[in-house]
């Protein structure tokens, strides 16, 4: 059974240019993590293996810095960068977890940025 | 720390058979696949054959298939590989190692962690 | 069966000088490539994976690069202990997966 839960930074906003950390965090389970994939859209952007480390697909590899932690940080936005991030949570029993974070990048240089949870 | 523990090496005449053992620790074993890769004295590295997590999809090189068995023990945290009609050519040190990948995150067949090795070796 | 083929066999490098070792595979592997480091008694050490992306623990000074059909594996600046045998690995994603030759890395 399932039981853990996956926290994310949720809705986020950035300034064109800038750069944002995507963070999830899995909670409320004992299950071991093998892997954690961050996509954008149907793209792989990185993979975190427990034996291999990170892995920056090479496509993102100029704008996509690994860390902090499990996170992933996103540099030089452009309007493109707008959209839907998901991390998926490879764990062992459970299976496989599932956080969305939704960014949106502001020409403006006013970007609010949405409710963020710090990670002890 | 992941630790692999191969065992069950040693001299066997033509034709005949071995298993070998390759004991697990440091890790959760079994949602890992697995692997057997061979490297003959003064020669490069083979891949031999690999085994799911659950141990549901099993692979071979051609030059083992029909002849070699991989399988697992998840509840003693030990791969296993019998080696049947044992020709000279199979003559080797023999690894298991640890896939980085699961079931659930698919796998790559690329190995970080490795035993120490265990040699075979096939002659009258 | 997809053949990787290593070149040179031997090379012969003075420490500190920089190392080009080269992996050629018979049919694309697109980037499903390792290189793998082995001394003498030992079992083989995975430097990279993925042609380009280092496994963890492993030294700036290994780089790896290509994909399709040609990789390189290059060491900027040879350390003592880096003087082995490094061979390639293709894993496209059904067996078998082969290894290269190999490459001797030895001292000038």
């Known amino acids: 059974m399932m039981t853990g839960t996956i926290e994310t930074t949720g809705n986020i906003s950035a300034e064109k240019g800038g750069s944002i950390i995507l963070q999830c965090h899995l909670s409320s389970t004992t299950a071991q993590v093998t892997q954690v994939n961050w996509e954008q859209q149907d793209q792989l952007l990185a993979i975190c293996n427990a034996d291999l480390g990170w892995h920056i697909s090479p496509s993102f590899k100029d704008r996509v810095a690994p860390g902090p932690g499990l996170g992933l940080t996103l540099q030089s936005l452009t309007v493109n960068d707008t959209g839907e991030y998901f991390c998926i949570y490879h764990t062992y029993p459970d299976g496989t977890y599932t956080g969305r974070i939704f960014l949106e990048v502001l020409e403006s240089s006013v970007a609010e940025h949405g409710a963020r949870f710090q990670i002890p | 720390e992941v630790q692999l523990l191969e065992s069950g090496g040693g001299l066997v005449q033509p034709g005949g058979s071995l298993r070998l053992s390759c004991a697990a620790s440091g890790f959760t074993f079994s949602p890992y696949g697995m692997s057997w890769v061979r490297q003959a004295p003064g020669k490069g590295l083979e891949w031999v054959s690999s085994i799911s997590g659950s141990g549901g999809r099993t692979y071979y090189a051609d030059s083992v298939k029909g002849r070699f068995t991989i399988s697992r023990d998840n509840s003693k945290n030990t791969l296993y590989l019998q080696m049947n009609s044992l020709r000279a050519e199979d003559t080797a040190v023999y690894y298991c190692?640890?896939?980085?990948?699961?079931?659930?995150?698919?796998?790559?067949?690329?190995?970080?962690?490795w035993g120490q090795g265990t040699l075979v070796t096939v002659s009258s | 069966e997809i053949v990787m083929t290593q070149s040179p066999a031997t090379l012969s490098v003075s420490p500190g000088e920089r190392a080009t070792l080269s992996c050629r595979a018979s049919?694309?592997?697109?980037?499903?490539l390792a290189w793998y480091q082995q001394k003498p008694g030992q079992a083989p050490r995975l430097l990279i994976y993925?042609?380009?992306t280092r496994a963890t623990g492993i030294p700036a000074r290994f780089s790896g690069s290509g994909s399709g059909t040609e990789f390189t594996l290059t060491i900027s600046s040879l350390q003592s202990e880096d003087f082995a045998v490094y061979y390639c690995?293709?894993?496209?994603?059904?067996?078998?997966?082969?290894f290269g030759g190999g490459t001797k890395v030895e001292i000038k």
């Open positions: 049919q694309s592997v697109s980037s499903n």
């Open positions: 690995q293709q894993y496209v994603p059904h067996p078998p997966f082969t």
């Open positions: 190692a640890k896939d980085p990948g699961t079931d659930s995150s698919g796998y790559y067949y690329i190995w970080r962690y």
């Open positions: 993925s042609a380009s």
